[in-house]
């Protein structure tokens, strides 16, 4: 009972991780001008991984595709390949995890095949959950480079009589939401994962069975029987999956405005 | 077509207050903000300040904050101009604006002159 | 806030006649999200509520007169009219749309000689 609890909250929790991540990867606020050092502007701009746009306040929105592969900063590339592929893994977890749920019931699937499928999508999960968190950081360490650097040179003027101020950006509502949802979908793998363990068949000792051999009385009494899942409680080959967390050692540059249209 | 009907003139004496209306027409009067525009005689164009008709929130310019109020009525899509304690500088014609494209006001009203004299 | 200086505050004209006005910003006008300036010009005619007549610099307003073009960028912009007509007689106005306040310039008086 446990066990298809754990799997079923694993996999609600996932599906909801999955959903956030393809909501922050579609959404057009990942970064929002910085109004910090200018609150009383009368235009609005905010950029997402496919789009930037800007809101007047009139209540006019003008949004510009970004209509090109090669012009766009590598950087803003290596994010969106991150979140396509935490969505790509995410729904290929879900698939295979729908059919792996101890609730449904497909033909005679034995609990061995559930307990592999079950351990497949939560290793997807957790990937994709470590791409999407690791697609949003990049974004966000990139957003902080560019602020100090736009900082830096706030103000540029000719002959300090016309003033400039460039527009910074700040982070957007959807980092916030890729961070969450990536969370979410990790640990709703990781659930997958431990209620793949109980879904493991368990030792199966098989009784004693005489075997009459004519002139022999000899009882032949076979040893425990390990199921070959691999699922048992054999911890020799047990593997622990780790996030790999890895520090940033190289400072970004990232445009302040990546709108290349 | 779209129209921004203006109440009429108005004689005040100085420390008095006037509601100047502005009733909207012609389109749907909660997408668009509404400015204020002041205009002594023979002088330009002076931004008070707008009102945005989906929240309610006002932003007031510097020099007219504290003496003035936008309000609504939504429901009459009428958007108001309060003026408190008239002075004799007060005397101006108030346009109400429609914003439109780039913040621009393509729509205005007629004007309200509002003469404040002793 | 953001100064609006128009130049000249006069100008007379005859009929015909091409006319530049100018108008410059203390702050450039620019937004940089969609590269697009935050300028508008409005034409003003006694006993008249303003009229737009441009916006975003460049961008002619519905109905308005192709003789009448708006251009420039940053903080230096201009209001051409091709060959004036006795009804583009008024003072014309240019506004900032980028900050608030929405501040507007003094103003360009066209007159007949």
């Known amino acids: 009972m446990a066990v298809t609890a754990c799997q079923g909250l694993g996999f609600v929790v996932s599906l909801i991780g999955i959903a956030g991540i393809i909501a922050a990867t579609c959404m057009d606020q990942w970064s929002t001008q910085d109004l910090y050092n200018n609150p009383v502007t009368a235009v609005f701009n905010y950029q997402g991984l496919w789009r930037s746009c800007v809101r007047e306040s009139s209540g006019f929105t003008e949004c510009r595709g970004y209509f090109t592969l090669l012009g766009l900063p590598a950087m803003l590339q290596a994010v969106r390949a991150l979140m396509i592929v935490g969505i790509v893994l995410g729904a290929i977890g879900l698939l295979v995890s729908i059919f792996a749920l101890k609730c449904i019931r497909i033909g005679s699937m034995e609990d061995s095949a559930k307990a592999n499928m079950t351990l497949t999508s939560g290793i997807m999960f957790i990937v994709s959950g470590l791409c999407a968190i690791a697609g949003v950081s990049v974004f966000a360490n990139m957003l902080v480079t560019n602020f100090w650097m736009s900082t830096a040179n706030m103000y540029t003027g000719m002959g300090g009589m016309v003033q400039t101020v460039q527009t910074r950006y700040t982070f957007g509502a959807a980092l916030f939401v890729g961070w969450v949802a990536g969370g979410l979908t990790l640990i709703g793998g990781v659930m997958m994962c431990i209620a793949c363990r109980g879904l493991a068949p368990e030792e199966t000792n098989y009784k004693a069975v005489s075997y009459h051999a004519s002139g022999h009385s000899v009882a032949y009494k076979p040893g425990g029987f390990k199921a070959s899942t691999g699922f048992g409680s054999n911890t020799k080959n047990k593997k622990i999956y780790d996030g790999g967390a890895r520090t940033e050692d190289e400072v970004q540059s990232y445009p302040s405005k990546h709108d290349y249209v | 077509q779209i129209q921004l009907a203006q109440s009429g003139p108005e004689l005040k004496k100085p420390g008095e207050t006037v509601k100047v209306s502005c009733k909207a027409s012609?389109?749907?009067?909660?997408?668009?903000?509404m400015n204020w525009v002041k205009q002594a005689p023979g002088k330009g164009l002076k931004w008070m300040g707008w009102i945005n008709i989906n929240t309610g929130e006002p932003r007031y310019a510097e020099e007219f904050k504290g003496r003035i109020a936008f309000s609504l009525e939504t429901s009459a899509s009428t958007a108001y101009l309060l003026i408190n304690n008239l002075k004799n500088e007060d005397t101006a014609t108030y346009f109400c604006?429609?914003?439109?494209?780039?913040?621009?006001?393509?729509?205005w009203g007629q004007g309200t002159l509002v003469t404040v004299s002793a | 806030d953001i100064v609006m200086t128009q130049s000249p505050s006069s100008l007379t004209v005859t009929v015909g006649e091409k006319v530049t006005m100018s108008c410059k910003s203390s702050q450039s006008l620019l937004n940089s999200g969609n590269q697009r300036n935050y300028l508008t010009w409005y034409q003003q005619k006694p006993g008249q509520p303003p009229k737009l007549l441009i916006y975003w610099a460049s961008t002619r307003e519905s109905g308005v007169p192709d003789r009448f073009t708006g251009s420039g960028s940053g903080t230096a912009f201009t209001l051409t009219v091709s060959s004036v007509q006795a009804e583009d007689l008024a003072v014309y106005y240019c506004q900032n749309d980028y900050s608030y306040p929405l501040t507007f310039g003094a103003g360009t008086k066209l007159e007949m000689k």
């Open positions: 012609g389109y749907t009067f909660k997408n668009y903000g």
């Open positions: 604006a429609r914003y439109g494209y780039g913040n621009s006001f393509p729509y």
